[in-house]
Structures are given as C-alpha cells and as structure tokens.
C-alpha cells in the first residue's frame, strides 16, 4: 500500500540564462528508495541510483548538475526549458511515486517563486 507523499517546489519561475534547483521530497513512508528519475515531459534528464549514484543523460550533461541531495540543478536556462518536470521515486515495497514541478523561464528580471504544494 502506498502511504507516502511527495512534496515538490511546485510552480516556479526563473530568469533566462540563470539556474534553478528542482527539489522533491518523499515522506510518510518507510519504503526503500532505489532510484529517482528526473524527467522533462517524456525525456529522461537524470537518474540518481541507490547503488551507482548519478547518471546524467548525455544530451543534458552541459546544463544539468546533480543535487543538492536528490534534487537537480538546471543551468543556462532558456525559454525552451519552460514546462513540466517530474521526479519519479522508485521505491520498494510501495512502488512508484511521481511529483510534478512546473517551471516558467522568464525573459524579464522578475522571477518569483511559487508556493510549495503537496502531491498525494
């Protein structure tokens, strides 16, 4: 039975050319986290594997950095980076938990962080 919840950084915005940290946190479960995937739509950005550590997809190596923790740092942001990002927690015995973050990359210097929210 899946009892956990994922808290994410929610809806966030950042400036073009800047960087942003995507963060998810799995709570309320004692399940083992065996792997965390970070995805943009259906593209795999990075994996944090409990045995192997981090693997960054080759096409994102220049602009994606692991961490902090199980989070992911996106650098040199462009307007094309606007969209949905997903953290996918592979756990045992619970199964798969998914959190969603919406990132808006702004041309202007006005970039405010959205409120935190929970995904059941």
């Amino acid at each position: 039975m899946m009892t956990g919840t994922i808290e994410t950084t929610g809806n966030i915005s950042a400036e073009k050319g800047g960087s942003i940290i995507l963060q998810c946190h799995l709570s309320s479960t004692t399940a083992q986290v065996t792997q965390v995937n970070w995805e943009q739509q259906d593209q795999l950005l990075a994996i944090c594997n409990a045995d192997l550590g981090w693997h960054i997809s080759p096409s994102f190596k220049d602009r994606v950095a692991p961490g902090p923790g199980l989070g992911l740092t996106l650098q040199s942001l462009t307007v094309n980076d606007t969209g949905e990002y997903f953290c996918i927690y592979h756990t045992y015995p619970d199964g798969t938990y998914t959190g969603r973050i919406f990132l808006e990359v702004l041309e202007s210097s006005v970039a405010e962080h959205g409120a935190r929210f929970q995904i059941p």
Epitope: T34, N37, D42, D51, L52, H55, Y92, D94, G95
Partner: antibody, heavy 119, light 107 residues
C-alpha cells in the same frame, strides 16, 4: 548486441534445488537492474525476482520469498537464481531480463531455460 | 496485488488490418504500463513503455495509449511478422504483474 543466455534448467523432484545462470554480454552489465521472470505451462508470465545494479536491493514476490535467491557477479557478467524447496507450481520457463535505466520496463530478455518440478 | 486483465485472449485478423488489444488494471497505475511481444522460440521484445513510448527500433505501426486503469495497444497495417503473443505489464507497484496475453493470428 545485447545478449542474455540462460542455463541450468532441468528436471527436479519436489523439495529439490536448482541454480539458474544468465550470461550477459553486449552491454555494461554492472549498471543495469536485472530480473528473473517465468512463464508457466499455461503461458502466463510471472515476475520472480529483481536485483539492483550493485546487488544492494533485492525484491521477490511472496510466492518465492524465502525459497529463491537472486544474486549477481558483475565481474563475470552473470546473473543467478538459486531455487530451493521447489514445488510443482514452480514448473516454468525461466527468463532473465534487463531493465531500462529509467526502470520503466524490461528492454531485453533471454530465450529462457526450462524447469520441471515433478516426482 | 494489481490484477491486469487483458483482452481478447486471442485474435484473428487479416494482413493490413488495424487491431487493438486492451489491458485493464484493477487499480490506478498512472502511465506505468509496458507492452511486450513474444514470438515462437521465446523471443520476447519490449514494444511500448510508459503507456505510449515506442521502444528503440520498434516499427511506428505499433502505438500505445491510456493512463490510470485503461490501456490499449494498437497495431496498424498488420504485417506477417506481427504474428505473436502480446502481454501488458504494470510497473506501478510490487509485485510486478502481467496480463494474460493476447495471441494474434493471421486469417
């Protein structure tokens, strides 16, 4: 070319033991999660065991927990399944399979080794 | 355990036809569904992962759709090499479970 070749199957009496092997080639074995899946004589597929890339995490369904042991030797590029206290319902074709890096699905399968448990 | 109910169990179609196989999960599995093809000689191949993503090297006549509890595999313009048994599998929770299979034959 990714290749997975199972061996070690055979005829065994109820209560007996058997050790299956899966020789992997054509990819960096030590970076992939691996599983054993079996196919019953009625052609139903059943997940049997999963082991993480470094062997730290191992998962089984209740039906084989305590009787089967999955292991791997990354230096030999080989996956194992030690089966003990075998029952007639364990009769099946046993496949080893590799999981996609994202753990979405099993992207390569061997052709299987047959296990028959009968007196 | 999550039950995966696959239908039909067998299917006969003509070359060039479009066929659909369905898989129903007993509880929500989001998009964590894969489709496999098994040919005689126990040659098993991944076709679709995450409900709709075509695996590398799989012809574009194969497509998958669905989320939650209902999923479909569609094969358009059926070819002789598509004669096989097709299985769905859920990756949402443990134990991993499979559908009962659909045996596809050519008329």
């Amino acid at each position: 070319e990714v290749m997975l070749v199972e061996s070690g199957g055979g005829l065994v009496k109820p209560g007996g033991s058997l050790r299956l092997s899966c020789a992997a080639s054509g990819f960096t074995f030590s970076t992939y999660v691996m599983s054993w899946v079996r196919q019953t004589p009625e052609k139903r597929l059943e997940w049997v065991a999963t082991i993480s890339s470094g062997g730290s995490y191992i998962h089984y369904p209740d039906s084989v927990q305590g009787r089967f042991t999955i292991s791997r030797d990354n230096a030999k590029n080989t996956l194992y399944l030690q089966m003990s206290s075998l029952r007639s319902e364990d009769t099946a074709m046993y496949f080893c399979a590799r999981w996609l890096l994202g753990l979405y699905a099993m992207d390569y399968w061997g052709q299987g080794t047959s296990v028959t448990v009968s007196s | 355990d999550i039950q995966m109910n696959q239908s039909p169990s067998s299917l006969s179609a003509s070359l060039g036809d479009t066929i659909t196989i369905t898989c129903h999960a007993s509880q929500n599995i989001n998009v964590w569904l894969s489709w496999y093809q098994q040919k005689p000689g126990n040659i098993t191949k991944l076709l679709i992962y995450k409900a709709s993503n075509l695996h590398t090297g799989v012809p574009s006549r194969f497509s998958g759709s669905g989320s939650g509890t209902g999923f479909t595999l569609t094969i358009s313009s059926l070819q002789p090499e598509d004669i096989a048994t097709y299985y769905c599998q859920q990756g949402q929770s443990y134990p991993r479970t499979f559908g009962g299979g659909t045996k596809l034959e050519i008329k």
